[in-house]
Interface confidence: medium
């Protein structure tokens, strides 16, 4: 029988900057029942507080509701594991809610094949930001990424849509059924999960155009460029 091993706070996430949850991994239990408590203080304060809600986030978690969540304040937190033989502390973790936002996926993804008489046909997609995100306040800049592939293909084709909530693609394989998904990321946070796949059948008479993958700048209202997922994860706006 031993004191408990060192726990580790391994993840903190917020859906919208208004609440957040942190999770920890217990260390070894030392062969005895072990109690865990999370304590925290805010940057510039010395008063320690205990986790306000150990239930909402599930086992080994601490949930901070609206009244406990401050933007632009760093939270300094640690977990204490205690059994009859002694205690151990996790390393401190520093959490700024601005940096840990992982939104829900975008909503209402609509995909249509557009075949204007005077222009080449294109695939048009439109979506809405996740419900919990209030873009009107200016707290958020959401970036979007789209991926699509023929139903039987292994590889996804990925496009960066910037802050737009619609996108047009010219070059597709006629007669194929495509899966389309979209995800979003706040400027300092994490990518959401991909939205549920939307299926679209590309007509057999859809004209291929390999030279112009994306519709022109004036049609899109801004320059388009392809950015890798890794680049984008580290893409910060200041």
């Amino acid at each position: 029988q031993l004191p408990p091993g060192k726990p580790e706070i391994f993840k903190c996430r917020s859906p919208n900057k208004e609440t957040f949850t942190c999770w920890w991994r217990p260390g070894t239990d030392g062969g005895l029942p072990t109690n865990y408590s999370l304590t925290y203080h805010r940057e510039g304060e010395t008063l320690m507080h205990e986790c306000p809600d150990y239930i909402t986030g599930g086992p080994n978690s601490c949930h901070f509701g609206k009244q406990y969540t401050s933007m632009w304040r760093t939270y300094v937190m640690m977990v204490n594991a205690t059994n009859q033989m002694g205690s151990s502390f996790s390393d401190e973790l520093y959490v700024d809610v601005t940096y840990i936002v992982q939104p829900d996926p975008p909503l209402e993804l609509t995909v249509e094949v557009k075949q204007p008489e005077d222009r080449k046909p294109y695939l048009w997609m439109k979506w809405s930001p996740p419900t919990l995100i209030d873009l009107k306040t200016g707290w958020f800049t959401l970036l979007y990424e789209i991926r699509l592939k023929p139903e039987k293909a292994a590889e996804w084709e990925t496009h960066f849509a910037g802050q737009q909530t619609e996108f047009k693609i010219l070059s597709l394989h006629p007669g194929q059924k495509y899966l389309v998904q979209v995800r979003c990321k706040p400027d300092h946070g994490y990518w959401s999960a991909w939205s549920p796949a939307t299926f679209i059948q590309i007509p057999s008479d859809f004209i291929m155009n390999d030279e112009q993958k994306l519709i022109s700048e004036e049609d899109l209202g801004g320059e388009q460029k392809l950015i890798s997922e890794e680049d984008l994860h580290h893409h910060h706006h200041h």
Epitope: I9, F10, K11, C12, E43, T46, T74, V76, F89, D91, E92, L93, Y94, V95, D96, Y99, I100, H188, G189, Y190, H234, H236, H238
Partner: antibody, heavy 120, light 113 residues
């Protein structure tokens, strides 16, 4: 106003011992990690040792491990560095530095430094 | 140990010019738990102790002029001075505080021509 005042430096022979002190004021000393960082003449910065608010949590550079001991007296707002078995390569200005947080994350205030010269 | 490498070792720049100093870490200092890069930038003027300019790779310390900014993530970081002033002549150091031993870059000496 945050102030950190180092003392205890001087000339010592190789193999000798010195004890550096750092008197802190202007902030709640017990709430912050503290560190020692050194700078050899004309050279860059080298982290030496840190101590968290829980005094049992101490960390050392490999170059000083087993020879130097960091400690703190929260009741006197003072940080210490006991340096044993000193070598010529320990010659440097030693800075006391306050961490931004309770652990060792970035040093937001530094003392003026105290010079340690190890020479025969 | 994490090795921090700065470039260039020294640079001479005109007053008012935009200046960048680069810092590369030998392994990532971005923590997935809180999405923070554990990197700081310091300025050291002759005969004085270092002064903290930037922490968490991009957060400006209070009182630091807004011409100083930090950017980058993972292993590659940049300190930018948007318009160089005479008082910015100094040596600049990056430092990682992701893992002990906490390590500094070798320094970049900034001078005015």
């Amino acid at each position: 106003e945050v102030q950190l005042l180092e003392s205890g430096g001087g000339l010592v022979q190789p193999g000798g011992t010195l004890r550096l002190s750092c008197a802190a004021s202007g902030f709640t000393f017990s709430a912050y990690a503290m560190s020692w960082v050194r700078q050899a003449p004309g050279k860059g910065l080298e982290w030496v040792s840190s101590i968290n608010v829980r005094a049992g949590d101490t960390y050392y550079a490999d170059s000083v491990k087993g020879r130097f001991t960091i400690s703190r007296d929260n009741s006197k707002n003072t940080l210490f560095l006991l340096m044993n078995s000193l070598r010529a390569e320990d010659t440097a200005a030693y800075y006391c530095a306050k961490a931004r947080y309770s652990s060792n994350w970035g040093f937001d205030f530094w003392g003026q430094g105290t010079l340690v010269t190890v020479s025969s | 140990d994490i090795v921090m490498t700065q470039s260039p070792d020294s640079l001479t720049v005109s007053l008012g010019a935009r200046t960048t100093i680069n810092c590369q870490s030998s392994q990532t200092i971005l923590h997935s738990s809180n999405n923070h890069n554990y990197l700081a930038w310091y300025q050291q003027k002759p005969g004085l102790p270092p002064k903290l300019l930037i922490y968490w790779s991009s957060t400006r310390e209070s009182g630091v002029p807004d011409r100083f900014s930090g950017s980058g993530s993972g292993t590659d970081f940049t300190l930018t001075i948007s318009s160089l002033q005479a008082e910015d002549v100094a040596i600049y150091y990056c430092q990682q505080y992701s893992n002990t031993p906490y390590t500094f870059g070798q320094g970049t000496k900034l001078e005015i021509n």
